[in-house]
């Protein structure tokens, strides 16, 4: 009984299509695969950023796989051929591993790369990124931002830079069609006549960095002798009501501070008839049903009632 063997895939490589971190892992079928023509040969692929403790593992019949990586670090991957037990009259047969690595040769020292990169997707409409120049770089250093997400043919450069002292320190992005709920890749590189500048790579999803506008139209309504309903409206813009969480800050008679987080555009407050002054502010944030993270909006304008019986009227700002 001869032992069944299978070769590893050929030409295993990581291909960078220029998408700033979204890479292709590709390979060719093993040599002598024709002996297993009636079989569905599979490949087990393992890959990770160098320094990561865990491998991602994929089993596929294809000759390619795509995923996003952090190009600030290297990438390592390995693959082997799997012959299912149906092909071998017994146990699964595996080839030896084929291995490959990929990294972008770094230029410049780490300190030259941009510092404190911060990106905010304002009201789920306008993306703005800002940064500080690298440590010790000269004024002739300029930084350029490139971005890509699935749906773009190629990486695009920022066309509307925010400048300070002639240097690019941020980017106002154009309308980004169909760009949420997918990885958004950014590279900020730089040039200087003085010394090479290190590139920086960033990946995030836009829905997770949304900063909404604050809520509007804050109102009071007396519900009963000891209950006041606070109401407000969702901010203008594309974010649906179901996507908001709110934080309310309420001050009664300048002494009691109440804070609460709610999911609806109302909050019922227990009060006494002696309440002489009531003020509240609200801010909004995209909730867990629409994103994994978010940024609180600014506080709304303050809405106050002072020195008048709340039972007699509704106060509208």
């Amino acid at each position: 009984d001869t032992e069944i063997k299978v070769n590893p895939p050929q030409d295993f490589e990581i291909v960078d299509p220029g998408y700033l971190g979204y890479l292709y892992l590709q390979w060719q079928p093993p040599l002598s695969l024709d002996h297993f023509k009636e079989c569905t040969v599979e490949y087990e692929l393992k890959y990770r950023n160098i320094g990561s403790e865990t491998w991602k593992t994929i089993i596929t019949k294809n000759l390619h796989y795509k995923d996003g990586f952090d190009l600030n670090k290297g990438i390592e991957a390995k693959i082997h051929t799997l012959l299912p037990w149906q092909c071998t009259n017994g146990s699964e047969v595996q080839s030896s591993w084929a291995e490959t690595t990929y990294w972008i040769s770094p230029q410049g020292i780490p300190e030259t790369k941009v510092q404190d990169m911060d990106c905010v997707y304002y009201n789920w409409q306008y993306l703005l990124c800002s940064w500080k120049p690298g440590i010790g770089v000269l004024l002739d250093t300029n930084y350029n931002l490139f971005y890509w997400y699935e749906g773009l043919d190629h990486a695009l450069q920022c066309v509307d830079y925010i400048k300070a002292d002639g240097q690019n320190i941020g980017c106002r992005f154009p309308y980004l069609e169909a760009s949420d709920y997918k990885d958004f890749y950014i590279c900020v590189n730089g040039s200087s006549e003085n010394k090479p500048i290190r590139s920086s790579y960033f990946t995030f999803q836009l829905q997770n960095i949304v900063k909404p506008l604050p809520p509007v139209y804050l109102t009071f309504t007396r519900e009963s002798s000891c209950e006041i309903k606070l109401k407000w409206s969702i901010p203008l813009g594309p974010i649906p009501a179901r996507c908001f969480d709110y934080e309310i800050e309420i001050r009664e008679d300048d002494t009691t501070l109440v804070t609460a987080t709610v999911e609806n555009e109302t909050y019922t407050l227990k009060t006494t008839n002696e309440t002489r002054q009531l003020c509240f502010v609200v801010r909004s944030k995209v909730n867990i049903y629409c994103s994994d993270d978010g940024i609180w909006s600014e506080w709304s304008d303050k809405q106050c009632w002072e020195g008048e019986d709340l039972s007699k009227k509704t106060l509208l700002r």
Partner: antibody
Framework: EVQLVESGGGLVQPGGSLRLSCAAS????????MSWVRQTPDKRLEWVAT????????YYADSVKGRFTISRDNAKNSLYLQMSSLRAEDTAVYYC???????????????WGQGTLVTVSS | DIQMTQSPSSLSASVGDRVTITCKAS??????VAWYQQIPGKAPKLLIY???YRSTGVPDRFSGSGSGTDFSFIISSLQPEDFATYYC?????????FGGGTKVEIK
């Protein structure tokens, strides 16, 4: 439409150099290995060189090893063949060819360009 | 290197004829053999790969068979547009070599 268009051929003296280019369109260029295949005046086909999809793996025929360099630029959808120390026996029509890939097989050529003629003569 | 010996080097046939071309590899190449058609003044065109798999859009009058070292290419009913030169090629391991070609001419 899948298309390969070669350019850069011409008349060159023995010992001279020439650079062939191949512009690809109509497919995801970075997904396929690419090759140069030549056809000699007696109509024989000879595989010259192959570069893998990402450019990490390169193969040459013994007859051109050390003299020819195959390369690719996936951003420009282009394949190149830098030929130096040319000899009379390198005279041929040079075809750019896409490496076909199926789950079971590879290294056959499923798309060919129209060819560019290289004549090495004094 | 694996040599591919193709025969005959030329043949004459009529429209409607069945044509068989053979190719012999100098060593076992499994089923890694492709067949190409070249019309004068044009680039070669892939017809068959992996010995018996037709390329996309290739008419079913073209077929291939064989494994190991002996391979056959058949045109079941020759059509006017089939008068051309046919080449075999092994796609087993580098260097990938071609047969010398078979010119199919009108009788």
């Amino acid at each position: 439409e899948v298309q390969l268009v070669e350019s850069g051929g011409g008349l060159v003296q023995p010992g001279g150099s020439l650079r062939l280019s191949c512009a690809a369109s109509g497919f995801t260029f970075s997904r396929n290995g690419m090759s140069w295949v030549r056809q000699t005046p007696d109509k024989r086909l000879e595989w010259v060189a192959t570069v893998s999809s990402g450019g990490s793996y390169i193969y040459y025929a013994d007859s051109v090893k050390g003299r020819f360099t195959i390369s690719r630029d996936n951003a420009k959808n282009s394949l190149y063949l830098q030929m130096s120390s040319l000899r009379a026996e390198d005279t041929a029509v040079y075809y750019c060819a896409r490496q076909g890939t199926t789950a079971l097989a590879t290294r056959f050529f499923d798309v060919w360009g129209q060819g560019t003629l290289v004549t090495v003569s004094s | 290197d694996i040599q591919m010996t193709q025969s005959p080097s030329s043949l004459s046939a009529s429209v409607g004829d069945r044509v068989t071309i053979t190719c012999k590899a100098s060593q076992d190449v499994g089923t890694a053999v492709a067949w190409y058609q070249q019309i004068p003044g044009k680039a070669p065109k892939l017809l068959i790969y992996s010995a018996s798999y037709r390329s996309t859009g290739v008419p079913d009058r073209f077929s291939g068979s064989g494994s190991g070292t002996d391979f056959s290419f058949i045109i079941s009913s020759l059509q006017p547009e089939d008068f051309a030169t046919y080449y075999c090629q092994h796609h087993y391991s580098a260097p990938w070599t071609f047969g010398g070609g078979t010119k199919v001419e009108i009788k």
